[in-house]
Amino acid sequence: SQPSASPGEPSPPSIHPAQSELIVEAGDTLSLTCIDPDFVRWTFKTYFNEMVENKKNEWIQEKAEATRTGTYTCSNSNGLTSSIYVFVRDPAKLFLVGLPLFGKEDSDALVRCPLTDPQVSNYSLIECDGKSLPTDLTFVPNPKAGITIKNVKRAYHRLCVRCAAQRDGTWLHSDKFTLKVRAAIKAIPVVSVPETSHLLKKGDTFTVVCTIKDVSTSVNSMWLKMNPQPQHIAQVKHNSWHRGDFNYERQETLTISSARVDDSGVFMCYANNTFGSANVTTTLKVVEKGFINISPVKNTTVFVTDGENVDLVVEYEAYPKPEHQQWIYMNRTSANKGKDYVKSDNKSNIRYVNQLRLTRLKGTEGGTYTFLVSNSDASASVTFNVYVNTKPEILTYDRLINGMLQCVAEGFPEPTIDWYFCTGAEQRCTTPVSPVDVQVQNVSVSPFGKLVVQSSIDSSVFRHNGTVECKASNDVGKSSAFFNFAFKGNNKEQIQAHTLFTP
């Protein structure tokens, strides 16, 4: 139809034949005329979106081919245009195809299979192998453009389709199209680093790998040094791959080949997509030389009861990792290295714990236990003073020539010796007797041994038959020794002496 315009206004060009659509048989001549005093050019956009130009007002295409199907536009110098759509009908080529098919999740995707013959029926989309299309897939056919798949789903990824139509009752199919779906971004990227802190010596190589995961390749990522303002780090190696559909992974490897002390700081791996951003930080500390720092031990003086177990535990930080650990008992090297383990599973861990288990300790095993640890750059030590608490043991209980009764006991802590007298009728000795003399002797070579206490009483104070009890006690327990007396006239005789250990 001829375009119309108001009098006095520039009018669009006229096209002959004066219709909006034209059907030409393939092999025939296509002839179009543009009528306009200010004619400028004819343009034709191919299926591949190529622009073909003709500056003659007549467009003549001898032996027209199906690929010449499309919109022909005539323009004038006023910028006004008129168009006609031409179908070049080819029995051997019903569909114009050749472009791949991509679609974005939640958007529409155009299957480019325009028809060369509008006089066909049931223009539609089918699955390549004759199976049913997904039940939720809807499409809208347009003979001049192709078939639009509405609201593409991720599940349609790799779906193989053909365009189809019926000509004279016969179904015709296009070549295959395999839909590639690009995921819609509905979440921020996932960003991770294996270590959140790193400790290095000057000159060591610092390497940290940041892993970025997202549904598509359009994620942006980078390493930044917080200085404290973020500075982009350019010397980063990138690796990336698809772990599967909609599972894209990228690795950004930051390397500082010879770390300096002033390289210390916070490094941020940053990633963003159209939904938002995510980041993770890792801290680098570069030290001039290695070190060992032993954490303060709450109590280096340890008291343990005879026969019991005790753990001597040392926590320390070391970098580089400790090379030698050793326990020394009373300044003599022990074969026992203790049990050494790292404080956490962190790969860059510098915190260690060493535990020496002393089992069923004897009274003779008290003393100094020293833990020594060293690495290539430093060494450190800590000493425990272990005291073994032992129940008093009465070593001797004698009647001396001078009439004294003497009791000697050992134990740790220092035993207290108490004396009691009781008559034969009493079940228990409860009458206290004051000692005449008390002496503490340290017979041990070291200050950690048992303490010996000697106590004496004067037997002449006793006027009746009975029993004298020497009782040695400390925090651990008590032991007793008994002296039995009988009077024969004026003579007092020690009849019997025996000990009784009270648990």
């Epitope: 979106n49 974005k104 995707a109 390749t217 359009s218």
Partner: nanobody, 119 residues
Framework: EVQLLESGGGLVQPGGSLRLSCAAS????????MGWVRQAPGKGLEWVSI????????YYADSVKGRFTISRDNSKNTLYLQMNSLRAEDTAVYYC????????????WGQGTLVTVSS
């Protein structure tokens, strides 16, 4: 103004290799999908390959799959097509083109570079 300039075409024997390059300017290359299209003498246009903006997703027409490799260097704004095991039927003018993902078509083209495979 979008400009795409192809280079690297020439005469090569069957079984040989060629590497085409395409220098891009006038747009933000690193965020655009790109591709190669070819036109054999007397024939219509045929898409060859497409690559996504980061250079990870690559797609090939069945006729070149396993022989051609598309790649890109976003720092140099350059697209490449490595062509191995060339055949006589690969003879064509090869065009570098910007692929519009949303409309499923190429929206800008280069002038093309001729590749002739002949003994």
């Amino acid at each position: 103004e979008v400009q795409l300039l192809e280079s690297g075409g020439g005469l090569v024997q069957p079984g040989g290799s060629l590497r085409l390059s395409c220098a891009a300017s006038g747009f933000t290359f690193k965020v655009e999908d790109m591709g190669w299209v070819r036109q054999a003498p007397g024939k219509g246009l045929e898409w060859v390959s497409i690559i996504d903006s980061p250079g990870i997703g690559t797609y090939y027409a069945d006729s070149v799959k396993g022989r051609f490799t598309i790649s890109r260097d976003n720092s140099k704004n350059t697209l490449y097509l490595q062509m191995n095991s060339l055949r006589a039927e690969d003879t064509a003018v090869y065009y570098c083109a910007k692929w519009n993902f949303d409309s499923n078509q190429f929206d800008y083209w280069g002038q093309g570079t001729l590749v002739t495979v002949s003994s």
